[in-house]
């Protein structure tokens, strides 16, 4: 903590600008006034102080607002956003998607750090539900976002958003979050055609049950093998031969390939011998 | 660009292990297999075993089994290989190689990691 | 296992020659499960031909697969000399995968 000196003789900062780099720590500290800087926190981003410089105007801003900084200030931090601990930021209330997307920018390119999971579990509880705007957000920033949240948090995004989730935002989903996300995802996409649901539905098949994959294959939708490969084992068990060779259409040839890996290996040995020998791919039950 | 990137060279003791691994980038590491493949000097190619990175089911060829460990950190989209009990006939160039799930042929491989068994 | 047998191991080729290389299975592979890599001294396999005769990406269309059953080979309708490499038959039709020793291609 920085000792209370008082500012030298004309020294005292009538803005925040360029000329505060020449100062010292116990300048700063001394002669910017801290309601000044809140008011001009903007301006701050625009100088290359040190870290240690930017230290102390976060311990101005902190002693002005030990409840909290108010949005205005928090929507102009930048780069001092970085100097935050999340029990800072767990004092913060924080509404405005703008606020919540110029502090996602200072850390782009970046692990998702634990200031930020907190400023986004601030916001989402604010919000009360994932809203496709703040979906939409935080994909765009990071695309394992969803698949970071657990079961009961997904519970909370309303079918609506799902319009937002691309299919890399899937990627590191297990099971359990797709189970989560499927339905939802059934109800977004319920009015869309054959074909064109299928496109929207596949990424988030790793949740459906048997009778979702059997009504799919009576759509000739040409399910690919990795599609097919992610699916929960206990959908696909209860799947004739018949309902699979429909579902992959011209890839079924592709379960010779997979036929040691589940959930393939496992529906294999359900089959009866004659049933697998239909497919002509010499797959053994 | 698809590629895979594999680290440098290692020179390990027998009886050692090596964890090799593959970076992938320029694609989704869950919608491929990946494989694993061997190449003794001046030698031909043998396959190790593969991974489909979605689930980290992994299959070994039986002449690996229960020495070779696939694995996948789908976060980072990296495929590992790791190899134990090492003896001087694992000296070898070992890659990874990207397989389209469905197929049995690989399309993109890796840069190649040289393992070298010595005392 | 299935044993994989290219024949010649080592073959030397002038510049427009006709170039086959052949691939003997111990057993019967389905011709989809069949696939040819080169490989260049210090550098990875490249996928070349796969499913018999299908030619991979950027593959010049000299290059030509064929085959059933036990037999199998590449031909290369005109030799030019950056086809000097070692060119190795896979295939996947049964468990453990296998490859050919490999034909290393020489340029005269």
């Known amino acids: 903590e920085v000792e209370k000196t008082a500012c030298p003789s004309g020294k005292k900062a009538p803005e925040i600008d360029e000329s505060l780099i020449f100062y010292k720590k116990w300048e700063l500290e001394a002669c910017v006034d801290a309601a000044l800087l809140a008011t001009q926190m903007d301006r701050v981003n625009a100088i290359p102080f040190t870290y240690e410089q930017l230290d102390v105007l976060k311990h101005k801003l902190d002693e002005l607002y030990p409840q909290g900084y108010p949005e205005s200030v928090i929507q102009h931090l930048g780069y001092l956003f970085l100097k935050m601990s999340p029990e800072d930021i767990r004092k913060w209330n924080v509404t405005s998607l703008e606020t919540l997307k110029a502090l996602l920018e200072v850390n782009k390119g970046h692990e998702m750090s634990p200031q930020v999971a907190t400023l986004i579990d601030r916001f989402v509880k604010g919000r009360g539900q994932l809203d496709k705007d703040t979906l939409d957000t935080l994909t765009a920033f990071y695309p394992g976002y969803l698949c970071s949240l657990s079961p009961e948090e997904l519970s909370s995004v309303p079918p609506s958003s799902i319009w937002a989730v691309r299919p890399q935002d899937l990627d590191t989903c297990d099971p359990r979050q797709l189970d989560v996300l499927y339905p939802k995802a059934r109800l977004a996409f319920q009015n869309m055609n054959g074909s064109e649901y299928f496109v929207k539905i596949q990424s988030f098949l790793g949740g459906a049950p048997t009778e979702d994959l059997k009504a799919l294959s009576q759509q000739n939708v040409s399910m690919d093998l990795a599609t097919f490969m992610k699916l929960r084992t206990d959908a696909v068990l209860p799947l004739t031969v018949a309902e699979v060779q429909k579902l992959l259409g011209p890839h079924v040839e592709g379960l010779k390939a997979e036929e040691r890996h589940r959930p393939v290996r496992d529906w294999i040995l359900r089959q009866r011998q004659d049933d697998l020998d239909t497919l002509g791919l010499g797959l053994q039950g | 660009e698809v590629q895979l990137q594999q680290s440098g060279p290692e020179l390990v003791k027998p009886g050692a292990s090596v964890k090799i691994p593959c970076k992938a980038s320029?694609?989704?590491?869950?919608?491929?297999?990946m494989d694993w493949v061997k190449q003794s000097r001046g030698k031909s190619l043998e396959w190790i075993g593969d991974?489909?990175?979605?689930?980290?089911?992994?299959i070994y060829n039986q002449k690996f089994e229960g020495r070779a460990t696939l694995t996948v950190d789908k976060y980072s989209s990296t495929a590992y290989m790791e190899l134990r009990g090492l003896t001087s006939e694992d000296t070898a160039v070992y890659f990874c190689?990207?397989?389209?799930?469905?197929?049995?042929?690989?399309?993109?491989w890796g840069t190649g990691t040289t393992v070298t068994v010595s005392s | 296992q299935l044993v994989l047998t290219q024949s010649p191991a080592i073959m030397s080729a002038s510049p427009g020659e006709k170039v086959t290389l052949t691939c003997s299975a111990s057993?019967?592979?389905?011709?989809?499960?069949l696939s040819w890599y080169l490989q260049k001294p210090g550098s990875s396999p490249k996928l070349w031909i796969y499913?018999?005769?299908n030619l991979a990406s950027g593959v010049p269309a000299r290059f030509s697969g064929s085959g059933s059953g036990t037999s199998y080979s590449l031909t290369i309708s005109s030799m030019e000399a950056e086809d000097a490499a070692s060119y190795f038959c896979?295939?996947?039709?049964?468990?453990?995968?296998?490859f050919g020793g490999g034909t290393k291609l020489e340029i005269k």
């Open positions: 499913s018999t005769s």
């Open positions: 991974v489909f990175p979605y689930n980290g089911d992994s």
């Open positions: 320029g694609y989704t590491i869950t919608d491929y297999n």
């Open positions: 057993s019967s592979v389905s011709s989809t499960y």
């Open positions: 896979h295939q996947w039709s049964s468990y453990p995968y296998t």
């Open positions: 190689a990207r397989r389209k799930t469905g197929t049995g042929y690989f399309d993109v």
